[in-house]
Each structure stands twice: as structure tokens, then as C-alpha cells.
């Protein structure tokens, strides 16, 4: 969490941002809140990106003002116009690109004063893994697949029964470049698995950590997956 203060004559307002990550090819949110104003026409929101020649987005007098928007953001940005009056200056960024990563500034002007706060925005690719029993294999084998990751993640297997065990000798992980030549499909195979045990496939890069669990018993197979972004710090 980053809290910024600004000085405008006698007054400053508090602006708060939250560091976040964007999944390339999907839409992302750059979060920013501020002390609200009673009149929408008195609120100016400017989003800037460090080292970029134009603005990322500008909202003033109740509407977008994009005459000075940088070409790299053209047609890809929007604020939540109906929520500006309550202090939400968050920016929606469409079709996140790898090159959108960097330091952004949310700069606010209201009748109460000015304020700004920076946020770090990371970009990459992350997806939920799915763990299945590989019935085609000669021995009991689990196959963990996740369709889109970037940068290249690490994959670690763990088991509930053999806690702390190192499965690197009995697993094999491969990375296959996807058609857009940036993200990769992650496939990891774990051999010699035992029944009545819960196995976890953990995929992690500097942006996200995802886990796929599978519990195999004689009567059923239970699966669970979850994904966590690693850099959600507020400012």
C-alpha cells in the first residue's frame, strides 16, 4: 500500500495505490483511491507512467480527456466514471502487454487540494494448474498442466504423507512456448505416486504462485487449485 500526499496552497489530499500484477492478454486494474469531493466537475485524475512521453489517462470535468494520451495506451484505458465521485480513481487497462510493466503515478486534483501516489505494476502470465492421473503411463503417474506462464516458473511437487520430501528425482517438467511466442505451457509429470495421498503441484514465478492439489483414493479423485499474486502491496 502506498499513501501519497500532495500540497496545493494550504491543502493536501491522501491518495492510496496498491501494487498489482497484470496477466498479459487479459484486462488489468491499477488501483487508486482518494478523499472524495462533492462535485465531479472539480475532480481531475491523471495516470502517468514513468519514462513515457504522453499521459496514460486523464479524466477531468466528468469525462475522459485523451488529447495528450500516449499512443501505447490508446484505446486501452478507462476509469470507473460512476465511482470517481466516491473516490475511486482506479484504471482499467485492456489487453495487458508485457511492456505495460513499470512505475505508475496516480495524480489527483480536487477542490480540497492535490495528491499523488506511485504503484509498481508487474506483468507476466499466470494460470491455474490442473492435476490429473495419467492413465496412459506405465506406472502410477500424475500430470500437472498450466496453460500460460511467463516468465518461466519453477515447479515443485509436495505430498501430504511425505512432507519435506524432494520429488525432483521422480518428476519431469517441460515448458512449451505458446503460439504468441511469449507465454509458455507448463507440464510436469510425477512418477511412482502412491494411493491415499494428497499431492500438490506448486508453480511459481516472481508474479504469481499457483497450486494444484489432487487426492487419489481407491474410490475417488479430489482436485483443488488456487492462485495467489505475490506483489499486492498498498501504497
Amino acid at each position: 500500500l502506498i499513501i501519497g500526499f500532495g500540497i496545493s496552497g494550504r491543502h493536501s489530499i491522501t491518495v492510496t495505490t496498491v501494487a498489482s500484477a497484470g496477466n498479459i492478454g487479459e484486462d488489468g486494474i491499477l488501483s487508486c483511491t482518494f478523499e472524495p469531493d462533492i462535485k465531479l466537475s472539480d475532480i481531475v485524475i491523471q495516470w502517468l507512467k514513468e519514462g513515457v512521453l504522453g499521459l496514460v489517462h486523464e479524466f477531468k470535468e466528468g469525462k475522459d480527456e485523451l488529447s495528450e494520451q500516449d499512443e501505447m495506451f490508446r484505446g486501452r484505458t478507462a476509469v470507473f466514471a460512476d465511482q470517481v465521485i466516491v473516490g475511486n480513481a482506479s484504471l482499467r487497462l485492456k489487453n495487458v502487454q508485457l511492456t505495460d510493466a513499470g512505475t505508475y503515478k496516480c495524480y489527483i486534483i480536487t477542490s480540497k487540494g492535490k495528491g499523488n501516489a506511485n504503484l509498481e505494476y508487474k506483468t507476466g502470465a499466470f494460470s491455474m494448474p490442473e492435476v490429473n492421473v495419467d492413465y496412459n503411463a506405465s506406472s502410477e503417474t500424475l500430470r500437472c498442466e498450466a496453460p500460460r506462464w511467463f516468465p518461466q516458473p519453477t515447479v515443485v511437487w509436495a505430498s501430504q504423507v511425505d512432507q519435506g520430501a524432494n520429488f525432483s528425482e521422480v518428476s519431469n517438467t517441460s515448458f512449451e512456448l505458446n503460439s504468441e511466442n511469449v507465454t509458455m505451457k507448463v507440464v510436469s509429470v510425477l512418477y511412482n505416486v502412491t494411493i491415499n495421498n494428497t499431492y500438490s503441484c506448486m508453480i511459481e514465478n516472481d508474479i504469481a504462485k499457483a497450486t494444484g492439489d489432487i487426492k487419489v483414493t481407491e474410490s475417488e479423485i479430489k482436485r483443488r487449485s488456487h492462485l495467489q499474486l505475490l506483489n499486492s502491496k498498498a501504497s
Epitope: 514513468e50 519514462g51 512521453l53 488529447s67
Partner: antibody, heavy 122, light 107 residues
Framework: EVQLLESGGGLVQPGGSLRLSCAAS????????MSWVRQAPGKGLEWVSA????????YYADSVKGRFTISRDNSKNTLYLQMNSLRAEDTAVYYC???????????????WGQGTLVTVSS | DIQLTQSPSTLSASVGDRVTITCRAS??????LAWFQQKPGKAPKLLIY???SLEGGVPSRFSGSGSGTEFTLTISSLQPDDFATYYC?????????FGQGTKVEIK
């Protein structure tokens, strides 16, 4: 101390190619956009090209669009200008300059290199 | 593209004179204008940015004013070190353009 040092200039024939480099030091290179500016002998300044801090955006003057390519390697703190299909009118001293950090807030073109001379002649 | 026109092209003045150079933009550039000084064989030096903000280390005799399409650079009392060529530059969004220059020479 901020320093910018250009290299790669020289004599080249019309239609030829040249690659200029600009080595930067003394500041966080990736935080700033960078520009190339040229000056023909006895003439004024002409902005040529710029690139955003992360390298995701590039910008060109109409006179060089399609012939010149700007790029940067932030791991090496180096800016490049690849010049193809060179013409006699591209003859100039080429300067690299530190461009903006934050739009509307910061100074720009506050540091310049010493320049490197490109001569296009047969 | 935005064009900048400087006037005059050449200005003859004496030490101690008050000197004014004008820069006109072909369309509004708000306050996105900088002024540079260049001496022969040297790289340009930033004097003023955002139309009126003085760059650090630049003497206070230099000042800038204006917004929209009309801008001025004023040297309140010309010093021997100030004889040089001066350029205005616009940086409206993602384009950059320089004026053609004004040479300040000794009268």
C-alpha cells in the same frame, strides 16, 4: 554524475547503414525516456526519435520514419539508433539526450552527449 | 505535426540589454515548451522547461513566459556569456519539435 557518450558515427555511402550507440551512466536509465537529436552542419536542431523508459513505445520524426529504428538495452544502460537507407540530408552531428521521466512533471533534455558525426557521401 | 516559429532569427544586442525572443506554435501546446542555449561546437543546454520553470543552475536573468501558442524567453540583462543561439522546443505529448533558432550576436 550523469554522462551520455555517443559512438558509431562515421562516413557512409548513400543507401548504406550505420548503428549509433549512446552509453549512459549516473542515473537510473530505465526510468527515463531517451531521445536522439541531430544537427546538420550550420543548421538548427532536429528531433529524430524517442523511446520510452521500458522500450515499449517508440516515436519518430516523419523525416526518418521507416528508415531509422530506436532501441535500448536497459541491462547495458545503452541507447541505440539503427539508421538504414541513409541519404545525404541525414549528414549531421547526432546527439543522444535524456528525455522525460514523468509527463508534465519533470525536466527533459537536461543532459546531452557530446555528439557523433555521421557523414553520408559517395 | 506542430510547427514552432521563432523570431527574430538574428538579434544584435549589447551587454546589459534586455533581450526578448518569441516562439509561436502552430497549435496549442499548453505549457509544454522548453528553451535551450547552444554555443558553437557544443551540445545544447536546457534553460527553461514547462514554459517558465528555470532549470537548476541557470542564472535568474533568464525567464520564460507564455502558454497555448505564444511564448517568450527574456534575458533581463545580457551578459558576455549569453551570446549564443537559442532554441525553443515543444514536447506536447509524444512529439518533439524545435524552433529554427535565434542567434544573439554582439551589436
Amino acid at each position: 554524475e550523469v554522462q551520455l557518450l555517443e559512438s558509431g558515427g562515421g562516413l557512409v555511402q548513400p543507401g548504406g547503414s550505420l548503428r549509433l550507440s549512446c552509453a549512459a551512466s549516473g542515473f537510473t536509465f530505465s526510468s527515463y525516456a531517451m531521445s536522439w537529436v541531430r544537427q546538420a552542419p550550420g543548421k538548427g536542431l532536429e528531433w529524430v526519435s524517442a523511446i520510452s523508459g521500458g522500450g515499449g513505445s517508440t516515436y519518430y520524426a516523419d523525416s526518418v520514419k521507416g528508415r531509422f529504428t530506436i532501441s535500448r538495452d536497459n541491462s547495458k544502460n545503452t541507447l541505440y539508433l539503427q539508421m538504414n537507407s541513409l541519404r545525404a540530408e541525414d549528414t549531421a552531428v547526432y546527439y543522444c539526450a535524456r528525455d522525460i521521466q514523468w509527463f508534465g512533471e519533470s525536466t527533459l533534455f537536461d543532459y546531452w552527449g557530446q555528439g557523433t558525426l555521421v557523414t553520408v557521401s559517395s | 505535426d506542430i510547427q514552432l516559429t521563432q523570431s527574430p532569427s538574428t538579434l544584435s544586442a549589447s551587454v546589459g540589454d534586455r533581450v526578448t525572443i518569441t516562439c509561436r506554435a502552430s497549435q496549442s501546446i499548453r505549457s509544454w515548451l522548453a528553451w535551450f542555449q547552444q554555443k558553437p561546437g557544443k551540445a545544447p543546454k536546457l534553460l527553461i522547461y514547462k514554459a517558465s520553470s528555470l532549470e537548476g543552475g541557470v542564472p535568474s536573468r533568464f525567464s520564460g513566459s507564455g502558454s497555448g501558442t505564444e511564448f517568450t524567453l527574456t534575458i533581463s540583462s545580457l551578459q558576455p556569456d549569453d551570446f549564443a543561439t537559442y532554441y525553443c522546443q515543444q514536447y506536447n505529448s509524444y512529439s518533439r519539435t524545435f524552433g529554427q533558432g535565434t542567434k544573439v550576436e554582439i551589436k
